[in-house]
Amino acid sequence: PEPPTACREKQYLINSQCCSLCQPGQKLVSDCTEFTETECLPCGESEFLDTWNRETHCHQHKYCDPNLGLRVQQKGTSETDTICTCEEGWHCTSEACESCVLHRSCSPGFGVKQIATGVSDTICEPCPVGFFSNVSSAFEKCHPWTSCETKDLVVQQAGTNKTDVVCGPQDRLRA
């Protein structure tokens, strides 16, 4: 018979032969042969593999480093990685939660809509027309543009969401 060019689900092609993949939680020790099944071994303590695989090494569980403010939310198994979260009152910097911050800052062009709490991080909002923020801050709101008119001045340079307007003296008509 013709050697296969594709294999069924949970199989892989090697040496013109379809071998069974190792199940989650196990790693490959040796490929199958004409006479033997694929040989797999369970992952060791603090290791995992989360898919049907032909990996020869298991992955190490994630380490929740307390020096970064992390703690274990869910302990890993042979089939799942450890899930980290932040200490109470701190917030993950990413979905993967690789480090923690007390709270995030709003970038220039954004103001703080709501200051962080123990359970929710800083909420930022874009500065609307007429307002600006030129700093990165975890508490400052967008500031209104300076009103040149109230100072008997004129706008020399328009404001943006990151910069205030620049006021200057009115041009006096020469006699």
């Epitope: 020096n67 970064l68 403010g69 480090s99 911050v101 709270h103 975890a138």
Partner: nanobody, 116 residues
Framework: EVQLLESGGGLVQPGGSLRLSCAAS???????EMWWVRRAPGKGLERVS?????????YYADSVKGRFTISRDDSKNTLYLQMNSLRAEDTAVYYC?????????WGQGTLVTVSS
């Protein structure tokens, strides 16, 4: 590496005053937003007060407004919190924090106990 060291805590009677300091070393202090945060026994973190990098803007939690004053002296790389009219509920460990607010920019804290 940035190091923040808080000091000035202690035991004080209700109505009394304390001045906390936070000395920064190992990095630039000027121009960075700074916060005072506290953790009362058995409670979560509470953001108490903040000051902008320029010192021109400040924030106070409602619970301390009118009683606490935040200030900074960039020439001394030091942040301050003047606490007046202290109450029992101000008892906590007080920490200072610097932008970008990671664990690397976080002090060990100073304990303030308000009790008669």
């Amino acid at each position: 590496e940035v190091q923040l060291l808080e000091s000035g805590g202690g035991l004080v009677q209700p109505g009394g005053s304390l001045r906390l300091s936070c000395a920064a070393s190992g990095s630039t202090f000027a121009g960075y937003e700074m916060w005072w945060v506290r953790r009362a026994p058995g409670k979560g973190l509470e953001r108490v007060s903040a000051i902008s990098g320029s010192g021109g803007s400040t924030y106070y939690a409602d619970s301390v407004k009118g009683r606490f004053t935040i200030s900074r002296d960039d020439s001394k790389n030091t942040l301050y919190l003047q606490m007046n009219s202290l109450r029992a509920e101000d008892t906590a460990v007080y920490y200072c924090a610097r932008d970008p607010y990671s664990f690397d920019y976080w002090g060990q804290g100073t304990l303030v106990t308000v009790s008669s």
